[in-house]
């Protein structure tokens, strides 16, 4: 069964700056990735970035840089200042659409005991929804 993993890291240099990394563990090719915060996309979450393998990347503040790391993983850096900046217990969700298999979404947040610059290893987060 395909799985999605989510890793959230706080940057040591900027304590309110976050890096989110997400990956898809499955055989299908990725057709779309949506990163949101505050809950799953479409269920109260707010979209931070959308990545399409052919048409490119769109991102919304406070997202600063979204990019493909591999064909099945992405990373997103969040700006740390301003009213819309994330806090330590913010939940981030990644939804991977794999055509024609379907969609898989998982969420994660900063590990409770993590020091700045450290993070938990990228283990698969619980799959919240598979369309």
């Amino acid at each position: 069964t395909p799985e999605v993993w989510v890793q959230v890291r706080m940057e040591a240099t900027e304590l309110s700056s976050f890096t989110i990394r997400c990956g898809f563990l499955g055989s299908g090719s990725i057709s779309l990735v949506t990163v949101s915060w505050g809950g799953p996309n479409g269920a109260g979450g707010t979209t931070l970035a959308v990545l399409h393998p052919e048409r490119g990347i769109r991102q919304w503040a406070p997202a600063r840089q979204a990019r493909w790391e591999t064909q099945s993983s992405i990373s997103l850096i969040l700006e740390g200042s301003g009213a819309s900046s994330p806090c330590a217990n913010t939940t981030f969700c990644c939804k991977f659409a794999s055509f024609p298999e379907g969609s898989w979404e998982a969420c994660g947040s900063l590990p409770p005991s993590s020091d700045p610059g450290l993070s938990a290893p990228p283990t698969p987060a619980p799959i919240l929804r598979a369309d």
């Epitope: 057709s31 779309l32 959308v50 052919e54 769109r58 991102q59 055509f99 024609p100």
Partner: antibody, heavy 117, light 107 residues
């Protein structure tokens, strides 16, 4: 109600310039890609240009270097600056919304551009 | 560039007929395809998105199917208001491209 209203069309001589505008209302403009699509008289639809929410731009090969798409999110406005116009650019130009990358869903009523001497 | 070949270019049908229009992509586009209806002097209106999902407010007699390179728009029972021109659009990669259109006329 979601609405797109184009303006700025008209008659222009070959080699001339024209600036089209599109006023958007009824939705959060900055969240959407915006496109220009044209239709020559009696012909089919042809995509012209796309601008992403942060200003990323994409063009049809035949207009690249002549047309410039831009947006002003604070004014809910989309623009198309058309330079070095040719007879082949004569068409109705539509402003179209897209929730990236899910395809165009809302269209304006169109504005007519005629390039003729 | 991805070419979208739409057929037929025109067809004559009667009210109540089942009508099928096809679009073939020159390379795979997954399900990144929409179908649009255009009436004379009017802007196009989206009927189907993601190849097979019905746009809100569109009658259920319209349906879409297909993925990859072969796509179909079906009108199960043609109504008087359905006489129009229909276009497919691929939005998988730039430049976005439309099919050539299918004009549905009254027999």
């Amino acid at each position: 109600e979601v609405q797109l209203v184009e303006s700025g069309g008209g008659l222009v001589q070959p080699g001339g310039s024209l600036r089209l505008s599109c006023a958007a209302s009824g939705f959060t403009f900055r969240n959407y890609d915006m496109h220009w699509v044209r239709q020559a008289p009696g012909k089919g639809l042809e995509w012209v240009s796309d601008i992403g929410n942060s200003g990323e731009t994409y063009y049809l090969g035949s207009v690249k270097g002549r047309f410039t798409i831009s947006r002003e999110n604070a004014k809910n406005s989309l623009y198309l600056q058309m330079n070095s116009l040719r007879a082949g650019d004569t068409a109705v130009y539509y402003c179209v919304r897209e929730e990236f990358p899910l395809g165009m869903d809302v269209w304006g009523q169109g504005t007519t551009v005629t390039v003729s001497s | 560039d991805i070419q979208m070949t739409q057929s037929p270019s025109s067809l004559s049908a009667s009210v109540g007929d089942r009508v099928t229009i096809t679009c073939r992509a020159s390379q795979g586009i997954r399900n990144d395809l929409g179908w649009y209806q255009q009436k004379p002097g009017k802007a196009p209106k989206r009927l189907i998105y993601a190849a097979s999902s019905l746009q809100s407010g569109v009658p259920s007699r319209f349906s879409g199917s297909g993925s990859g390179t072969e796509f179909t728009l079906t009108i199960s029972s043609l109504q008087p208001e359905d006489f129009a021109t229909y276009y497919c659009l691929q939005h998988n990669s730039y430049p976005l491209t439309f099919g050539g259109g299918t004009k549905v006329e009254i027999k």
